[in-house]
């Protein structure tokens, strides 16, 4: 079935019984409404499963699927399936065809910005195209972060986008770094944000048939020193077989620059701890947020002698955070068994008395051990 | 079909200049955002220079600005990359790459162009 | 800049394998990454676009997942045209920044 100017099933009468499926190509930026069943006892219009919302710019309503101006991302599957029977009362495939502008790519809805188009379409209010993209209201950012506005929207004529700041047009003039502003992707970008740059922002998107707006809310975050944070329960008890690989992770948060430290515990002399009652430690990997993979320890064709305690130990200039997992290396001859690995319950202090390497941060500091 | 022709790379001595050119075609050239990306040899990928269809919107990597300008002639189809002050951390292959409208994902490349930057 | 922590760097996989890439931004990005596959030799080929969009012509056994800070790729079944360098890219700043890339080798 090739659709032409719209994409239409009217009017809204029952169905037949034999409901076949059926393939609809529609171009870019067209318009489509499809029935299904009479409006008040009309289906309820399900796209890849899930069912579609009464309001939007794909919506479901009334046994009616409406969609605004058809974009690449609403190709696909759409039922249609009768109120409490669940019966299917239309089975449709929507396909991406051309789009209604002289080109030929159809990756993408260009009819909405080419102000040149030479089709006569009806004119359009502007209306948003990616409402998704716009759920977050609230940005609340730490301090030197990039903050991005977006509005994507569509209407013939094309719109037109501008922002306020808290009503008051806004350039961006008197911001230090100023402001970027992306107009195909309907955008305000920000960077390096500062508590002044706080408050409401709207975007005002508008053409000669209507105007729509959207606010924002602006918070930047004061920079509040802290050691690093670990996420819980990294890194975790790890059961492997002799010969595998086994990777441990540890996800760490921290606003100053944080470095890393994967510590393998040892036994030296017979013991895991020295005189002063700290324990020994192994210094397995080094570096900085930045490098690749440093959150990772691999562990390649693991041995007997690789099971033990691990310890990710993350430092900035504030403080020392670390955790500790149990690493259980099992015999190739009997993958099935598992040990529950002892659990750690420290409350000596823990010292490091090794040669971090790490800027002074980790020397003779004294720390509490946390799980 | 969307296709993307790079010329222009070579041999340049460092402080010297080079014009890249990016033919465009199979697609309506001016409603679109363009980018230029390059790959030093053996590195990973990284991000240059991007212009929107209408040139009123223009970025740069902090490590090329002021040393490079993009440009575009919608007229005709072409995308350009004006590299002066040439520097040996220049040498890479450099691609033209087009934008998805509404994101700014590179959703057609053009094959590279060499551009090695010795004495 | 933003800054985009790519893992692993490099890792072997076999035929049919799962394989997971994961990429880590240095702020909050929302969903505006994308992931791109090389081969050598070759321009880069746009594989996920918004985390988690699927290109045309890509086949089903790649997604992407994730928002805000932490991202992921997966190829659901390894295939022999699959061994190549990922890289993830976001474009969340104007300043548009990649991963280190992810090479992924026969094992």
């Known amino acids: 079935l090739e659709a032409s100017e719209e994409v239409e099933l009217e009017p809204c009468l029952a169905p037949s019984l034999e409901q076949q499926e059926q393939e609809l190509t529609v171009a870019l930026g067209q318009p489509v409404r499809l029935c299904c069943g009479r409006a008040e006892r009309g289906g309820h219009w399900y796209k890849e499963g899930s069912r579609l919302a009464p309001a939007g710019r794909v919506r479901g309503w009334r046994g009616r699927l409406e969609i605004a101006s058809f974009l690449p991302e609403d190709a696909g599957r759409y039922l249609c399936l009768a109120r409490g029977s669940m019966i299917v009362l239309q089975n449709l495939t929507l396909i991406t065809g051309d789009s209604l502008t002289s080109s030929n790519d159809d990756e993408d809805p260009k009819s909405h910005r080419d102000p040149s188009n030479r089709h006569s379409y009806p004119q359009q209010a502007p209306y948003w195209t990616h409402p998704q993209r716009m759920e977050k209201k609230l940005h609340a950012v730490p301090a030197g972060n990039t903050v991005k506005f977006r509005c994507p929207a569509a209407g013939n004529p094309t719109p037109t986008i501008r922002w306020l700041k808290d009503g008051q047009a806004f350039h961006g003039e008197n911001r230090i770094g100023g402001i970027r502003l992306r107009h195909q992707h309907w955008s305000l970008v920000m960077e390096s944000v500062v508590p002044s740059d706080r408050g409401t922002y709207t975007c005002l998107v508008e053409n000669a048939v209507g105007s729509i707006r959207y606010n924002y809310l602006l918070d930047v975050l004061e920079r509040s020193p802290h050691r690093p944070i670990l996420q819980a329960g990294l890194p975790a008890n790890t059961t492997a077989v002799v010969g595998s690989d086994v990777e441990l992770l540890c996800k760490v948060y921290s606003d100053a620059q944080p470095h890393i430290q994967w510590l393998k515990h040892i036994v030296i002399n017979g013991s895991s701890f020295g005189a002063d009652g700290f324990p020994y430690v192994q210094v397995l990997k080094t570096a900085d947020i930045n490098s690749s993979e440093v959150e990772v320890l691999y562990l390649r064709n693991v041995s007997a002698e690789d099971a033990g305690e691990y310890t990710c130990l993350a430092g900035n200039s504030i403080g020392l955070s670390y955790q500790s997992a149990w690493l259980t290396v099992l015999p190739e001859e009997d993958p099935t068994w598992t040990a529950a690995a002892p659990e750690a319950r420290y409350t000596d202090k823990l010292e490091f008395r090794h040669d971090s390497g790490l800027n002074d941060i980790f020397e003779a500091q004294k720390i509490e051990w946390h799980e | 079909q969307v296709q993307l022709l790079e010329s222009g790379g070579g041999l340049v001595q460092p402080g010297g200049s080079l014009r890249l050119s990016c033919a465009a075609s199979?697609?309506?050239?001016?409603?679109?955002?363009m980018s230029w990306v390059r790959q030093a040899p053996g590195k990973g990928l990284e991000w240059v220079s991007t212009i929107e269809g209408d040139s009123n919107y223009i970025e740069y990597a902090d490590s090329v600005k002021g040393r490079f300008t993009i440009s575009r002639d919608n007229s005709k189809n072409t995308l350009y990359l004006q590299m002066n002050s040439l520097r040996a951390e220049d040498t890479a292959v450099y691609y033209c790459?087009?934008?998805?409208?509404?994101?700014?994902?590179?959703?057609?490349w053009g094959q590279g162009t060499l551009v090695t930057v010795s004495s | 800049d933003i800054q985009m922590t790519q893992s692993p760097s490099s890792l072997s996989a076999s035929v049919g394998d799962r394989v997971t890439i994961t990429c880590r931004a240095s702020q909050d990005i929302s969903s505006d990454l994308n992931w791109y596959q090389q081969k050598p030799g070759k321009a880069p080929k746009l594989l996920i676009y918004?985390?988690?969009n699927l290109q045309s012509g890509v086949p089903s056994r790649f997604s992407g997942s994730g928002s805000g800070t932490d991202f992921t790729l997966t190829i659901s079944s390894l295939q022999p045209e699959d061994f190549a360098t990922y890289y993830c890219h976001q474009w969340y700043s104007t300043l548009y920044t990649f991963g280190q890339g992810t090479k992924v080798e026969i094992k």
């Open positions: 790459a087009r934008e998805r409208t509404y994101s700014s994902a590179f959703d057609y």
């Open positions: 918004d985390a988690s």
């Open positions: 199979g697609f309506t050239f001016s409603d679109y955002a």
